[in-house]
């Protein structure tokens, strides 16, 4: 299915307009913004739900160390360029003619330049590091229900491939969650890692993406899992290029 | 659509042990969970326990030592067993489902079991 | 154990009149992350299942008239009913999901 025909609406994106104008009277729904049609069973990718927020009216375990070219999105939001096909264009600029280069989930991998900037192709992010430090509980979470929850919630909510789900870390309070997945292991049909961990963010923000949805409601075994902090890692299949003046 | 259908014996005697079946369909136990809750006549609801969809159990504290959940996903079945009924255990017993991430909410109840304690 | 205290425990109203009554939980309801209430009302006719009215505090259900309010945060929660109709008389509801579930003791609406 396209859509929810009986009320004609887009079940995995709010920020969506919805007319049965398809083919034979079926429901089809466009993305705020970039008027793109989009698929309503699977999530709708990142780029296009950046473009439509920006449309939209202004109202013994251990923790895994961040590589050095892991990348943190410290821009913030932006109006993104996307192609045909809903990816970000890999590069970008704003209205002040200021250029960027940009990965597959559209953060900035090299320094703002001019509109000469090239940016020859769109870098894959492959691996994802999520983590969150939640609220303190009574006792930690059980590590393998913490993580048997989290997987489920990844299949199950943003439809997304258990293999896609590297590793669940958990040492109280801080949780981290891996996704990996290389162009090469990505199928036609496979939801996107960055798109998976995009909606994550927004439903742990209490910003759910999700039609009629209020919010994210995790628990294990009953307790529900507050997250009062998160920080989402990117690391790409070619290192990021900046300058040595950011590093320092 | 979603269906939840309490069963079990309406008429159970003092000391002994009340079993209740929750029958879904419309959807899966392994994805949502299901809520035991009870109301004595003319009084207030009580929460009783619940069985989520991982499998894991919580009950509520001041019957706990009675109650036991379980489920058995490919029947779509979930079991409510409580012993040593006394006669203010008396009263309508509904299943309802947990609307899994989008909230603790029990958006669809069953119609109700009556079940009485009496010798 | 969160205790919920609803008030009053019963409101006589005429129709066409507002209803507003009260729920307040021993401790807060709020998730400090996502800022929302583990908070729902329900409502329940007489020999008729619960009937889920508000989630997440102020959230109304699909189907549910727009005359149900749902507001408060915290400790302090509050349904209201801007116009009450003939088939509004029922018992409602207040429930935490903040550590697993209580109800409230309930409001039951009559009309006047």
């Known amino acids: 299915h396209t859509a929810a025909q009986d009320n004609c609406t887009c079940p995995t994106n709010k920020m969506t307009v919805c007319s049965p104008d398809g083919p034979g009277g079926r429901c089809q729904c466009r993305a705020l913004g970039s008027g793109m049609a989009v698929d309503c069973s699977t999530l709708t990718s990142k780029c296009l739900l950046l473009k439509a927020r920006m449309s939209a009216p202004k109202n013994a375990r251990t923790l895994v160390r961040p590589s050095e070219h892991a990348l943190v999105d410290n821009d913030g939001l932006y109006d993104p360029d996307c192609d045909p096909e809903g990816r970000f264009k890999a590069r970008q600029c704003n209205q002040t003619s200021v250029c960027w280069c940009v990965n597959s989930v559209g953060v900035r991998r090299t320094d703002k330049g001019d509109l000469s900037l090239r940016c020859d192709e769109l870098v894959r992010t492959h691996h994802i590091l999520i983590d969150l430090r939640h609220r303190p509980t009574a006792g930690a979470f059980n590590h393998s229900d913490l993580d048997a929850e989290l997987r489920r919630l990844f299949r199950e909510r943003y439809r997304l491939h258990p293999k896609f789900v590297a590793a669940v870390h958990y040492e109280q309070p801080t949780i981290q969650i891996e996704l990996r997945q290389n162009t090469s292991q990505k199928a036609a049909g496979d939801v996107d890692i960055g798109d998976a961990a995009y909606y994550f963010e927004r439903d742990i923000k209490g910003e759910s993406l999700f039609q009629g949805r209020g919010g994210l409601d995790l628990r294990v075994r009953g307790e529900p899992l507050q997250v009062e902090r998160t920080l989402i890692y990117y690391l790409d299949e070619i290192p990021p290029k900046f300058s040595m003046k950011r590093l320092t | 659509q979603v269906q939840l259908q309490e069963s079990g014996p309406g008429l159970v005697k003092p000391s002994e042990t009340l079993s209740l079946t929750c029958t879904v369909s419309?959807?899966?136990?392994?994805?949502?969970?299901v809520n035991w809750i009870r109301q004595p006549p003319g009084k207030g609801l009580e929460w009783i326990g619940v069985m989520w969809a991982g499998g894991s159990t919580n009950y509520n504290s001041a019957l706990m030592s009675r109650l036991s959940i379980s489920k058995d996903n490919s029947k779509s079945q979930v079991f409510l067993k409580m012993n040593s009924l006394q006669t203010d255990d008396t009263g309508m017993y509904y299943c309802?489902?947990?609307?899994?991430?989008?909230?603790?909410?029990?958006?669809?109840w069953g119609q109700g079991t009556l079940v009485t304690v009496s010798s | 154990d969160i205790v919920m205290t609803q008030s009053p425990s019963s409101l006589a109203v005429s129709l066409g009149e507002r209803a507003t009554m009260s729920c307040k939980s021993s401790q807060s309801l709020l998730n400090s992350g996502t800022r929302k209430n583990y908070l729902a009302w329900y409502q329940q006719k007489p020999g008729q299942p619960p009937k889920l009215l508000i989630s997440?505090?102020?959230s109304r259900e699909s189907g549910v008239p727009d005359r149900f309010s749902g507001s408060g945060s915290g400790t302090d929660f509050t349904l209201t009913i801007s116009s009450v109709q003939a088939e509004d008389l029922a018992v409602y509801y207040c429930?935490?999901?903040?550590?697993?579930?209580?109800f409230g003791g309930g409001t039951k609406v009559e009309i006047k």
């Open positions: 997440w505090a102020s």
């Open positions: 419309g959807f899966s136990l392994t994805s949502y969970g």
């Open positions: 429930k935490q999901s903040y550590n697993l579930f209580t």
């Open positions: 309802a489902r947990d609307e899994n991430w989008d909230g603790a909410w029990f958006a669809y």
